[in-house]
């Protein structure tokens, strides 16, 4: 389980009218459910139940976003429509270039994501918890356009991007 270095870039307009980027760094873990790869895309917050919908149209998302899912306490959803791994798969099927799970409320999800899968996803599935998760969700809950960059090594420079 390697460390995932996540940079969250917020686009803010400055008084001069230009756009400034603010970068926040946090760490998570690459789970065995996905690949240990770099990925980047606009952050799209997804409700766990939102991943239950299986309409054809819902699979026609544009490619290249990073899904952020805050998992709820298991007792709030005793009969989930999909396993955590199933939810990650559904997000990737819809065009997510990576999925980040906040497992703070549901630490059991870590074991589910790390069960050796014969067919792991070809995109990264990262989990965050504790202070890093709080930091991430604080940014995600702002009404701002934000991009996440996930890397499997510490970022060399704060503005580094990589190919999708």
């Amino acid at each position: 389980k390697e460390t995932a270095f996540v940079e969250v870039v917020l686009f803010e307009s400055s008084p001069s009218g230009d756009y400034t980027t603010y970068t926040t760094g946090l760490t998570g873990r690459f789970s065995r459910a996905g690949a240990t790869l770099s990925a980047e895309g606009e952050i799209v917050q997804m409700h766990p139940l939102g991943l239950c919908n299986n309409n054809d149209e819902e699979d026609l998302y544009e490619y290249g976003w990073v899904g952020v899912v805050k998992l709820e306490q298991p007792e709030l959803d005793p009969k989930p429509c999909l396993t955590v791994l199933g939810k990650a798969k559904r997000a990737v099927q819809r065009g997510a270039t990576a999925v980040i799970f906040d497992v703070s409320e549901n630490p059991e999800a870590i074991d589910q994501l790390n069960q050796g899968s014969e067919d792991p996803l070809k995109r990264p599935v990262v989990y965050v918890k504790g202070a890093d998760a709080i930091k991430l969700m604080n940014i995600v809950n702002k009404q701002k356009v934000a991009r996440a960059r996930i890397q499997h090594r510490p970022p060399r420079q704060p503005t580094e991007y990589f190919d999708m």
């Epitope: 756009y19 917050q45 998302y61 990589f162 190919d163």
Partner: antibody, heavy 116, light 107 residues
């Protein structure tokens, strides 16, 4: 079937305001980012504004401070408020779905003509 | 803001010919560039995203490549239905910017 239908265009005098709407159907509107793109008659495409699914916004330099993009998820509708209009804002205005970029789904466009 | 220079602005080509359109950016945008096709009187459609990925249902004669800050759209063998305007869009840095377009016409 994904559908985007723009409305609200028309003839308006310089300095006046107009509000464009884009009605969405066939997908979960609240989950998606949305763009406005415009095209002056016989000219190229000009990216105008974007709103994320959590209502974060970004604008092109040409419209920042004059135009406002917004959305009403309960009505599956995207808006573009055009203030202090100039003759150079004359164009067909398209709405398009997409996160990082305008994707496969665009509306047919609504024509805004700014003239005295 | 990132400048996108598209060339040529117009292009005359024969059916079956190989066609290449180029976009050059003022700074590195990695592969954050799309190509759109717009036929006369129609709405633009997404052709290629992230520089090289062909949009579903688009013919395989279209392809995208890039090297550094230079991006190319290639049509391997021109068909009558390919007569259109072509635009590139950088979406690496906000605000996003389109190239000025290329008008592709039959010789």
């Amino acid at each position: 079937e994904v559908q985007l239908v723009e409305s609200g265009g028309g003839l308006v005098q310089p300095g006046k305001s107009l509000k464009l709407s884009c009605s969405a159907s066939g997908f979960t509107f609240s989950s998606h980012g949305m763009h406005w793109i415009r095209q002056a008659p016989g000219k190229g495409l000009d990216w105008v504004a974007y709103i994320s699914n959590n209502s974060g916004t970004i604008y092109s330099a040409a419209v920042r401070g004059r135009f406002t993009i917004s959305r009403d998820n309960s009505k599956n509708t995207l808006f573009l408020q055009l203030n202090s209009l100039k003759s150079e804002d004359t164009a067909i205005y398209y709405c398009a779905r997409g996160y990082n970029y305008p994707g496969a789904y665009w509306g047919q466009g609504t024509l805004v003509t700014v003239s005295s | 803001d990132i400048q996108v220079t598209q060339s040529p602005s117009s292009l005359l080509a024969s059916l079956g010919e190989r066609v290449t359109i180029t976009c050059q950016t003022s700074q590195s945008i990695r592969n954050y560039l799309n190509w759109y096709q717009q036929k006369p009187g129609q709405v633009p459609i997404l052709l290629i995203y992230y520089a090289t990925s062909l949009q579903t249902d688009m013919p395989s004669r279209f392809s995208g490549q890039y090297s550094g800050r230079s991006f190319t759209l290639t049509i391997t063998s021109l068909e009558p239905e390919d007569i259109a305007n072509y635009f590139c869009l950088q979406h690496y840095s906000v605000p996003y910017t389109f190239g000025a377009g290329t008008k592709l016409e039959l010789k």
